[in-house]
Interface confidence: medium
């Protein structure tokens, strides 16, 4: 259904938004496999503590995505 | 090419705001995370805040969480530090840096700011 | 929050004599996070050494930087006169980045 609300990113989904750029910008031959694998190493040298932001900000769109999804669901019943 | 240039630095009473900006040419200044760190007269370096490159994150040292803000706008390669509550231990050369290829390797002239009555 | 503390505070040496300057972290760090600066009056900072021992495009040779896990070193072969500076190690958190720079070793001239 186009108006159900849209799958939920992860922090890592949310990390890698932020420095594909900067990754695809500064190695233009890098295959998309290879982009994906040095976000993938980057996130794995983060500290649990650097990854906060990542996660709270992902738990805060979670959060926004239920109360969506039973506005939805609500809205989709018969009365 | 890469240079960042601080301004907005000056002289301001105590409990008052201040907002610092650094214009950054010669690179993708929104593929880059950008940095404020200081130095207080005759004292070390110390960091005070950064933001990621898309602006969505931001970090502060807890001496100015709370009333520090910083920010950026891509569209005008621009930095921003709004300070407001300032205090005299908030005097210092403020520095604008980026990490261009590794580290903290790109830097500012500085800007200075006063906090005096 | 890790700190870092350099050692000696000040370090009074003749050119030609070699420098030894101590950073030390309260916990153990990845070396690919340890970076050392070098600050002249009135100037910047400058990238001497990242990665605990790569050396920063301009870096001189005589400059080389060692250590792992809390204990970090940087070594001035032989001091020339524009070396005479106060050195900063430093310490990066990621994403975005969170900086703890030790308090500084001023390098003078005896």
């Known amino acids: 259904d186009p108006n159900a609300p849209k799958r939920l990113p992860s922090a890592f989904f949310l990390f890698c938004s932020e420095y594909r750029p900067k990754i695809k910008g500064e190695h233009p031959g890098l295959s998309i496999g290879d982009v994906a694998k040095k976000l993938g190493e980057m996130w794995n040298n983060t500290a649990a503590d650097d990854k906060q932001p990542y996660e709270k900000k992902a738990a805060k769109l979670k959060e926004k995505y239920e109360k969506d999804i039973a506005a939805y669901r609500a809205k989709g019943k018969p009365d | 090419e890469v240079q960042l240039l601080e301004s907005g630095g000056g002289l301001v009473q105590p409990g008052g705001s201040l907002r610092l900006s650094c214009a950054a040419s010669?690179?993708?200044?929104?593929?880059?995370?950008m940095t404020w760190v200081r130095q207080a007269p005759g004292k070390g370096l110390e960091w005070v805040s950064s933001i990621s490159p898309s602006g969505g994150y931001t970090k502060y040292a807890d001496s100015v969480k709370g009333r520090f803000t910083i920010s950026r706008d891509n569209s005008k390669n621009t930095l921003y530090l709004q300070m407001n509550s300032l205090r005299a231990e908030d005097t210092a050369v403020y520095y604008c840096t980026t990490e261009f290829y590794d580290y903290l390797d790109v830097w500012g002239k500085g800007t200075t700011v006063t906090v005096s009555s | 929050d890790i700190q870092m503390t350099q050692s000696p505070g000040t370090l009074s040496l003749s050119p030609g004599e070699g420098a030894t300057l101590s950073c030390r972290a309260s916990?153990?760090?990845?070396?690919?996070?340890l970076a050392w600066y070098q600050q002249k009056p009135g100037q910047a900072p400058r990238l001497l050494i990242y990665e605990a021992s790569k050396r920063a495009t301009g870096t001189p040779a005589r400059f080389s930087g060692s250590g792992s896990g809390t204990d970090f070193t940087l070594s001035i072969s032989s001091l020339e006169p524009e070396d005479f500076a106060v050195y900063y190690c430093q310490h990066r958190h990621n994403w975005p980045p969170q900086w703890t720079f030790g308090q500084g070793t001023k390098v003078e001239v005896k």
């Open positions: 916990q153990s760090v990845s070396s690919t996070y």
């Open positions: 010669g690179f993708t200044f929104s593929w880059y995370d």
